[in-house]
Every structure is written in C-alpha cells, then in structure tokens.
Amino acid sequence: MKVLQEPTCVSDYMSISTCEWKMNGPTNCSTELRLLYQLVFLLSEAHTCIPENNGGAGCVCHLLMDDVVSADNYTLDLWAGQQLLWKGSFKPSEHVKPRAPGNLTVHTNVSDTLLLTWSNPYPPDNYLYNHLTYAVNIWSENDPADFRIYNVTYLEPSLRIAASTLKSGISYRARVRAWAQCYNTTWSEWSPSTKWHNSYREPFEQH
C-alpha cells in the first residue's frame, strides 16, 4: 500500500481543516488508514482522524482544531496499521479556504432597489471576521447568458443594485462566496442560492 498523491490540506481558519490524498489502488480509507495530527506547541497532544473514502482510491479527513492562529504548524503522520506511509506538516494560515457565507436574503421592497444581505460565516473574535470580501453571483433561470458577478470589496455583507439592471418579470437566483486577501485564501464554496421574481415599474415615458 502506497500513497500516490500526498495529502494536501485546507483550513477554514476556525475549527476544521480538510486533508485529501490518493492511494495507489482501491482503499477502504476508514478501516485501513489513520491520519495523526499534532499542533507543534507546548503540551499539545496527537489526535487521530479517521478518513472517509473520496472516490475509489481517494481519501479525505476532517481534522478538528481547537482554534487557529497564524503561527500554528501541525505535524501529519499517515499510518496503515503499524506502517508509516507518509510524514508531513501543515500550516493552516498558509492554506485557508474560508467558510461559505450563509443566510442570503433578497429584499425586494426597497423602492426599485434590490438589497441582498448575507451573514459573515465567522464569529467576531475570529481574525477573518473583519477581513472577508465577497463575490455575489446573480443569474437568470430563463437565460443562461444573463449571468453576472458583483465584487463586494467593503466589509459589510450586503449589496444594493437597481432592480432595473435586471430584466423585469422573470426569476433570478443569487449566491455569494467569500475570500480574504490578508491570507491569500482560495474562494469559499458558494452559499446556497436564493430565488426571487424580479419586477419593477418601468419609468413613465413623457412624449
């Protein structure tokens, strides 16, 4: 039994890091393998992660972390019984994938303005709370070409757009994702999408 693709890990910079790897053949990850991880810190202890299958030869493990700070470094040991298959390390702050925003809501009752709001996925005491920026994706269910991205580079989790920038009388969907420039993170997953019917009064034309 050998590791074909070494583990790569990403952290949500809060409580979970996810590591994925591939074996050289079909593997029952949960029964055959264990990933041991330990914070390099005074009086820390090793923890065991039981991996799950992720495709035939792929494995994934969700590492639970007490909290995360920028200096953190973890040792990782992948075991098959008594055999050490791979040894490595992981610095969560260098491999951050933020949590997805939640509670995306479209407020349509604000005088021909659409107000989209969502929740920051981090608590106020987490470093990322004040460092997230967002991308909002809006698309038409009827017209695949009607697809747009709005970059929200301020901290407030909201976006205002004129209803008239979208077509009237049809349904739209929106979703939002986040990233943090400070840690050069990847984008989060998209939030669940929300749907609304776009309608607004056409401006009265004077002749």
């Epitope: 914070l39 390099v40 810190f41 005074l42 009086l43 820390s44 202890e45 090793a46 007490d66 909290d67 700070v69 920028s70 200096a71 953190d72």
Partner: antibody, heavy 120, light 108 residues
Framework: EVQLLESGGGLVQPGGSLRLSCAAS????????MHWVRQAPGKGLEYVSG????????YYANSVKGRFTISRDNPKNTLFLQMSSLRAEDTAVYYC?????????????WGQGTTVTVSS | EIVLTQSPGTLSLSPGERATLSCRAS???????LAWYQQKPGQAPRLLIY???RRATGIPDRFSGSGSGTDFTLTISRLEPEDFAVYYC?????????FGQGTKLEIK
C-alpha cells in the same frame, strides 16, 4: 462557576517533600492543559510546570526539573504537584492555572494560591 | 530561552491619565503567544490580554494590547482608581513559558 482550589501548602524543612492538590470545578479538567505558577514573597511570577490534557506530556522550568512532578487525575478533576528536595528558594505562593483554550491563549483561570514555606 | 524585559519598573500616574507599559522579548516571537496580566496585592493574577491584542472576557475596552516581533505594549487609555496594580507580560509559546519581571503602576 469555573473555579480552581489549591491545597496542601505548609511549612516544610529544607530537603523535605510536599504534595499540592488543585480541585477543579465548573469545567472538565481533561479538556485543558494545566499549569503551576509560583510567586516568591515580594517577587514576580515564575512558571513552574505544566501537563497536557491526557498526561501524555509534561514540562518543567529548569529550576524545578528533577525535583518536582506534575500529575493529574481527570476523573476526579484534580491536578497535583509533588515537590521533593525542597529548598529555601522554593518558598512561594503556588497557583494552579488553566489556559484559555486547550493548550494556549493565556492563563484565564487562577486559583487563590497555597503558600509553601521552606525553612528550618 | 527567551527573556521578557518590562519597562518601566514603576510608573507613577494619576487617574484619568493614559498608561503605556512596554514588554521587550530577547528574540522575535509570534503575536499569538504574548499575554498580559494584572495583579493586585493579596490576589491572584488576572488575564487581561492574550494573542497580543485580544481582550479576555470581561476586560474593559480601556485596556488594549499591540506590538509585533520583539516589542509589545499594553495601553490603558484612561486610568481608573482600580487599575493601579502590577502588570506582567507573558510568553506562552511553542516550547516555553516565561513572564516579564512586572511593572508596578502606582498613583502619583
């Protein structure tokens, strides 16, 4: 309420032994690294020793290494410090301390302290 | 072993004034590992700041921490009578724990 209560201090002769205890309440001891910190009369704080949540690892200041032993009884929510070959310079108030998160984050819960006097 | 040096040894100020206490490490340390404590006579120390700048539960916002590398600061923006005490900085690091020698903040 989260509390730590030390006991076992007293007067002991140089070269003697003493065992300090710390009873934890209001939280699960097994979830935290725990420590002993001391303060000699009129002096500053000095770190003494620490122990990991399941006793897998321990750490000692150089000044007590080989003479003091830290241990814990998680089911009884109690921390111990066995002190032997005591010296006059070990005279201090000994505090039992919990860290804010599992291993770190500052020491957020302190006991009221127990006084150890080493004198002939 | 990293040594923490606090200055000044004693700081004499009046209520309402701003207090700035310094802690210098003998070598660079992570901001995650620096904490500040307050101790009043006959009492156990109390955690004020951890992770250089994060206030512990229940600590008033007149207390703030800052710094990086080797130089760290505890600032009390407007001194209240109950703030006069001894303050300690602490390194709680990946391989050791040490305290500074303390700064006594006294009423002028």
């Amino acid at each position: 309420e989260v509390q730590l209560l030390e006991s076992g201090g007293g007067l002991v002769q140089p070269g003697g032994s003493l065992r300090l205890s710390c009873a934890a309440s209001g939280f699960t001891l097994s979830s935290y690294a725990m420590h002993w910190v001391r303060q000699a009369p009129g002096k500053g704080l000095e770190y003494v020793s620490g122990i990991s949540p399941s006793s897998a690892s321990t750490y000692y200041a150089n000044s007590v290494k080989g003479r003091f032993t830290i241990s814990r009884d998680n089911p009884k929510n109690t921390l111990f410090l066995q002190m032997s070959s005591l010296r006059a310079e070990d005279t201090a108030v000994y505090y039992c301390v919990r860290v804010k998160s599992k291993y770190r984050g500052g020491m957020d819960v302190w006991g009221q302290g127990t006084t150890v006097t080493v004198s002939s | 072993e990293i040594v923490l040096t606090q200055s000044p040894g004693t700081l004499s100020l009046s209520p309402g004034e701003r207090a700035t206490l310094s802690c210098r490490a003998s070598q660079s340390i992570s901001t995650a590992y620096l904490a500040w404590y307050q101790q009043k006579p006959g009492q156990a120390p109390r955690l004020l700041i951890y992770g250089t700048s994060r206030r512990a539960t229940g600590i008033p916002d007149r207390f703030s921490g800052s710094g990086s590398g080797t130089d760290f600061t505890l600032t009390i923006s407007r001194l209240e009578p109950e703030d006069f005490a001894v303050y300690y900085c602490q390194l709680y690091g990946a391989s050791s724990v040490t305290f500074g020698q303390g700064t006594k903040l006294e009423i002028k």
